[in-house]
Interface confidence: low
């Protein structure tokens, strides 16, 4: 894509000129010593408060004034007298300043030659003080000549810039780092024989101006409009320039509030947030028991999420963060909260066995639930004859010994485990005592 | 309380292998980072290897880059540093550590088991 | 990689005086630094982060400024439990990086 002067839509933004470097065809005694107004070194680009406003620093158009090599402006005095006395066209037009005009149909640059006269050129070749079809990268010499002036002429030697085509502006900006930087570069997108030595590149954002091919702006507001002009020098002679109004991306959103998040059941939790002030698209909710980690997308709009389906008796971590789609995504910070769901009913405990270990004893064993859902642990071992409880013993382990029975007696055995909240089913075994042996 | 248990230092010959072993307790062991760091005797601190919650970002020293390798496994709450090629310079105090929730410093480390490479 | 140094190596102080331990950093690791204590024979123990956020439960004597390249972590009165050797760690850029220790001792 070519560089546009600017962007379409945005009529109403006006594009300021950069101050330019005097525009000499030939090397002066003195040096250049114009200046920029401006320090990149400490000023900080700011937009103006305000939804997507540009800075005002950016629209401060100003009048370009050409400069002499010296960086004074150029004064013509004159003597007068009886036979005044013609300066030489050498010297009159010692300091002539040319501004380079292209035509990207037939490629050639026409020179205009600043001067307040209609001047004459060597060879006839320049039409109202413009020198046409001059090749890039070529040198032509012209011969300026007056009737106000004496030879010798001014032979002044333009040297043609690359194509204007040759040169693009690119934004490089890094898609992660888009919310609060910009990067501008200067791309050389064909060949050309001019010595690159000669080019100079000039950016100038706000009041910041940068002298580099490639500019970086940093610590920018998110979500706001900056104006750039640039422009390309030959010989410090600008022959191409461009403006770019660039938004930076949305930034990271902030991080919610979250006003409570809590469990009031065994199998349930409810967290509720303020949203972040920054614009975003969804909400992540992540939420973590031990090593187990499970992520939801929520909508926008929510301020509070329902957990359903959760385990007994288990610390939950919730996390909670907006994210945006902008050039990337973007995570804002996570809020977190944490909650312990309500007890339940333990499961019921398994591989229950009852073996005889003498004529009236009885070793019962199992194995613990599989999901206890409480804070405690205890075994209950009550063993029934008939329809009598004849014993009620409760241990720490599900390791039950039970003497003294009755001999050629039916039982029946239930072992269940307690949480200190809530016991769990029985595991229930039918066993008989033999006839005694003696 | 927080605990970390480092294991399976030894006396190894240059080119030999060893696995070192850190178990994890008194912490949700599958949120947080973990590192390896390593001490040679009577030297400084060398970081030697990260890994994120579920092991899809890791990082090395340069200096053992190709000859280790870290990794855990959350069910059960352990971290590991696979080292092949070993070196006399790999001789150290091994140091697992824990990274506080949200800044790349260690708030917990384990006491260290100790690899000798020597011939 | 960005190289740490510690000066000085070592630090005779007496118990009840001042001790500053300096960090310096080859580039800038902005605030991105934490400092740590190592007694003989124990595993280091993390005192300051964000170059001067102190941990909970650590001593307000312990304390830690500086920022970019220059760093200082202060011990205002030292006790017997202080002396041991001190790091300095940067976590700004991979790889992490510690200093080569400052052993404070007594004097």
């Known amino acids: 894509q070519s560089p546009t002067p600017s962007p379409t839509g945005v009529s109403s933004v006006q594009t300021p000129h950069l101050p330019t470097h005097a525009d000499s065809q030939t090397p002066s005694a003195g040096t250049d010593t114009q200046t920029f107004s401006g320090s990149a070194a400490n000023a900080k680009l700011n937009p103006t408060p305000g939804s997507n406003a540009i800075s005002d620093a950016y629209l401060n158009a100003s009048e370009t004034t050409t400069l002499s090599p010296s960086g004074s402006a150029v004064i013509s005095t004159t003597t007068i007298a009886t036979t005044p006395s013609k300066p030489t066209c050498d010297e009159k037009y010692a300091n002539i300043t040319v501004d380079y005009l292209y035509n990207k149909e037939t490629k050639l640059f026409t020179a205009k030659l600043n001067v307040n006269e209609n001047v004459e050129c060597g060879n006839n070749t320049c039409t109202n003080n413009e020198v046409h079809n001059l090749t890039e990268c070529k040198n032509a010499s012209v011969s300026i000549s007056h009737n106000s002036c004496t030879a010798p002429d001014k032979t002044l030697i333009l040297d043609v810039p690359p194509g204007v085509e040759k040169f693009q502006l690119h934004d490089c900006t890094q898609v992660e780092k888009a919310d609060t930087t910009i990067c501008l570069k200067w791309k050389n997108i064909e060949t050309f024989t001019c010595d690159t030595q000669n080019i100079t590149y000039r950016f100038q954002c706000g009041n910041m101006i940068f002298d580099n091919k490639e500019i970086k702006l940093e610590n920018l507001e998110p979500e706001h409009e900056y104006k750039c002009d640039s422009e390309i020098l030959y010989n410090n002679h600008k022959f191409t320039n461009a403006s770019k109004i660039i938004k930076t991306d949305f930034g990271s959103p902030g991080e919610p509030q979250i006003i409570f998040c809590r469990s009031e059941a065994a199998h349930q939790g409810v967290i509720t947030w303020n949203p972040p002030q920054r614009s975003f698209h969804n909400f992540t909710l992540c939420y973590i028991k031990e090593t187990e980690k499970d992520c939801l997308n929520l909508d926008k709009n929510l301020i509070k999420y329902d957990l359903q389906n959760l385990k007994p008796y288990t610390k939950y971590v919730l996390s909670l963060h907006a994210y945006i789609i902008a050039k990337v995504q973007r995570n804002g910070s996570a809020a977190m909260c944490h909650f312990t769901t309500k007890s339940a009913p333990p499961s019921q405990v398994w591989n229950m066995t009852v073996s005889m270990t003498s004529d009236n004893s009885m070793h019962v064993k199992c194995r613990p639930p599989r999901d206890r859902n409480g804070p405690h642990e205890r075994y209950h071992l009550e063993v029934e004859a008939g329809n009598t409880l004849v014993r009620n013993e409760s241990h720490k382990n599900c390791d039950f010994r039970v003497k003294d029975l009755q001999y050629s007696t039916d039982y029946t055995f239930k072992a269940y485990f307690h949480n200190g909240d809530y016991p769990g089913e029985p595991f229930i075994l039918h066993h008989s005592t033999s006839y005694n042996s003696k | 309380q927080v605990q970390l248990v480092e294991s399976g230092g030894d006396l190894v010959k240059p080119g030999g292998s060893l696995r070192l072993s850190c178990a994890a307790s008194?912490?949700?062991?599958?949120?947080?980072?973990l590192s390896w760091i390593r001490q040679a005797p009577g030297k400084g601190l060398e970081w030697v290897s990260y890994?994120?919650?579920?092991?899809?970002?890791?990082k090395y020293a340069d200096s053992v880059k190709g000859r280790f390798t870290i990794s855990r496994d959350n069910a059960k709450k352990t971290l590991h540093l696979q080292m092949n090629s070993l070196r006399a310079e790999d001789t150290a105090v091994y140091y697992c550590?824990?990274?506080?929730?949200?800044?790349?410093?260690?708030?917990?480390w384990g006491q260290g088991t100790l690899v000798t490479v020597s011939s | 990689e960005v190289v740490m140094t510690q000066s000085p190596a070592t630090l005779s102080v007496s118990p009840g005086e001042r001790a500053t331990l300096s960090c310096r950093a080859s580039?800038?690791?902005?605030?991105?630094l934490a400092w740590y204590q190592q007694r003989p024979g124990q595993a280091p123990r993390l005192l300051i982060y964000?170059?001067?956020t102190r941990v909970t439960g650590i001593p307000a004597r312990f304390s830690g400024s500086g920022s970019g390249t220059e760093f200082t972590l202060t011990i205002s009165s030292l006790q017997s439990e202080d002396f041991a050797v001190y790091y300095c760690?940067?976590?700004?850029?991979?790889?992490?990086?510690f200093g080569g220790g400052t052993k404070v001792e007594i004097k």
């Open positions: 550590a824990r990274r506080t929730g949200t800044t790349t410093v260690f708030d917990y």
């Open positions: 008194g912490f949700s062991f599958s949120g947080y980072y």
């Open positions: 890994i994120s919650l579920s092991g899809s970002f890791i």
């Open positions: 580039q800038s690791v902005n605030s991105n």
């Open positions: 964000g170059a001067s």
């Open positions: 760690q940067q976590y700004n850029n991979w790889p992490l990086t």
